[in-house]
Interface confidence: low
């Protein structure tokens, strides 16, 4: 007769391993005992249970409550056992002995290798601000055993670099995505995608990017300066800028304080029906935590009494 | 026979440096496992300081992070633990040992520390 | 950070009774607690590891229980020769590990 088992075992930590060791032997042969040991525990063999064709399973010290026999209905040439809630401590080579009668013993070994499935971590980098050369945007670490894989999902253009630090049981991946900044990127996902053979499927972590900017600023209302003229009602200026954080507005005049009558509501400037008071230069200040803008725009507010057109200047400042 | 034996000066000034070594018999540092040290102190507490693994990679116990430094001979079998800038509150008895995180399974016989001027 | 509590500080027993020492951790950490013996003038011993498995060549008296938050080390014979500080210890945090504050077996 002969031992069937497997040269390798694999499974998940906090699974049950089921270690095989099946004797097919001749007609009329038995098993009278099969006996499971750790074969490379530091200090010799580490029994594990004792399998006996009368008295049943018994369990060494160390492994009490955790080997058992695999359910209902057993073979008696079956001499396979489980362990319950395999640990990372418990990979490394076992040996099941068989003996039979009347062929005498056999042996077998096999390895048992405990997966450790990683729990990866998500790291974002420093700020993201528009203007920075390549900057790290976030790092992704995963521990486990084997070694997992680590790499990125996302339409976002940068670079990675990965390092790895093997420990005695497992090894630490982690994976760096750089990029350079651009106001683009805002809203976009960055995904860090975790392989291990110990997943079901793979595990995904998304870190939305952030990049702080502050678009130039500008002023519409002017666009037609004949409208300009005394007595209009409705007239406004707009001031036009984007940024991330989303920018604040504040309305000057450079030329003394704002006329009585004109008000301010964020970025627009509203004004009471047209005097040639509310003729003067006027400044949109845009600012956000990580810059600030200027846009400057001459008002003169015309005389139909008068011939001759007044020139409008837009001047933009940052 | 796994065996660790750790060596040191005994008296150590306050302010100063302290250097011990960890020699080890019957194991290669390089072959697998994890080289602590830990340290008893006088009021019966055991502290966790670091430990250099058997690539090289060291870790340490974070309030210590900033004096604390484990390095390795590997042709010689040893590693040892340099702590800086010692105060009175290091006066411990000092251990090297091996092991995991399925616990530390050998000891070294300890090493008696005092800092006094 | 995983705070372990030991208790009581001391605990004192006759010979031949059973003794448990206590070790409460401050968030569940499975059974990732491994217990160790440290008798005066020696280094400490590993008597159990991942809160239940023993050791080779420790006394079959000493045995561990519990998982999550609440261990247990059981004595359950005391010997003279068991006079001695018990202290557990974590993996959870690995690579970083704690210990416990000990506790002390005296023999009335």
């Known amino acids: 007769g002969e031992l069937e088992t497997s040269d390798v075992v694999t499974v998940v930590l906090g699974q049950d391993a089921k270690l095989p060791c099946f004797y097919r032997g001749d007609s009329g042969e038995q098993v009278g005992q099969v006996a499971w040991a750790r074969v490379d525990a530091g200090e010799g063999a580490q029994e594990l249970a004792l399998l006996h064709s009368k008295y049943g399973l018994h369990v060494s010290p160390a492994y009490e409550g955790r080997v058992e026999q695999p359910p209902p209905p057993r073979n008696p040439l079956d001499g396979s056992v489980l362990l319950r809630n395999a640990v990372q401590a418990d990979e490394g080579e076992y040996e099941c002995r068989v003996s039979t009668f009347p062929a005498g013993s056999f042996q077998a070994r096999l390895r048992l290798r405990v997966l450790v499935p990683p729990l990866p971590s998500l790291n974002p980098g420093p700020a993201l601000e528009e203007g920075q050369g390549l900057t790290l945007a976030a790092s992704c670490t995963a521990e486990g055993s084997p070694a997992p894989s680590v790499t990125w999902d996302t339409e976002v253009k940068g670079t990675t670099s990965s390092r790895s630090f093997k420990h005695s049981r497992s090894a630490a991946v982690t994976s760096e995505f750089h990029l350079v900044p651009s106001r683009s990127m805002n809203g976009q996902p960055l995904t860090c995608v975790v392989s291990h053979p110990g997943l079901l499927q793979d595990q995904r972590i998304t870190h939305i990017l952030h990049v702080s900017f502050l678009a130039e600023a500008s002023v519409r209302g002017l666009e037609d300066q004949n409208l300009w003229h005394i007595g209009r009602e409705g007239a406004m200026l707009k001031c036009l800028s984007e940024g991330q954080p989303p920018p604040s507005y504040n309305w000057t005049r450079l030329d003394g304080p704002l006329p009585s009558g004109v008000r301010v509501d964020g970025d627009t400037l509203g004004f009471p029906p047209l005097t040639t008071e509310h003729s003067g230069i006027y400044v949109c200040h845009v600012s956000n935590e990580f810059s600030s803008r200027d846009s400057q725009v001459t008002v003169d507010v015309l005389d139909p009494q008068e011939d001759s057109g007044k020139q409008v200047d837009l001047v933009s400042a940052s | 026979q796994v065996q660790l034996k750790e060596s040191g000066p005994g008296l150590v000034k306050p302010s100063q440096s302290l250097s011990l070594t960890c020699t080890v018999t019957g194991y290669s540092i390089t072959s697998d496992y994890d080289w602590h040290w830990i340290r008893h102190f006088p009021g019966n507490m055991l502290e966790w300081m670091g430990y250099?693994?058997?690539?090289?990679?060291?870790y340490y116990n974070p309030s210590l992070k900033s004096r604390i430094s484990i390095t390795h001979d590997t042709s010689k079998n040893h590693f040892f633990l340099r702590l800086n800038s010692v105060t009175t509150e290091d006066t411990a008895t000092y251990y090297c040992?091996?092991?995991?995180?399925?616990?530390?399974?050998?000891w070294g016989q300890g090493t008696t520390l005092t800092v006094s001027s | 950070d995983i705070q372990l509590t030991q208790s009581p500080a001391i605990l004192s027993v006759s010979p031949g009774e059973r003794v448990s020492f206590s070790c409460r951790a401050s968030?569940?950490?499975?059974?990732?607690i491994h217990w160790y013996q440290h008798r005066t003038n020696g280094s400490p011993r590993l008597l159990i590891k991942?809160?239940?498995e023993s050791i080779s060549g420790i006394p079959s008296r000493f045995s561990g229980s519990g998982s999550g938050t609440d261990f247990t080390l059981s004595i359950n014979s005391v010997e003279s020769e068991d006079i001695a500080d018990y202290y557990c210890q974590q993996s959870k945090s690995w690579p970083t590990y704690t210990f416990g504050g000990g506790t002390k077996l005296e023999i009335k």
């Open positions: 250099i693994s058997f690539s090289g990679r060291t």
């Open positions: 968030q569940n950490i499975g059974t990732s």
């Open positions: 040992a091996r092991g995991n995180y399925d616990g530390f399974d050998y």
């Open positions: 991942f809160a239940s």
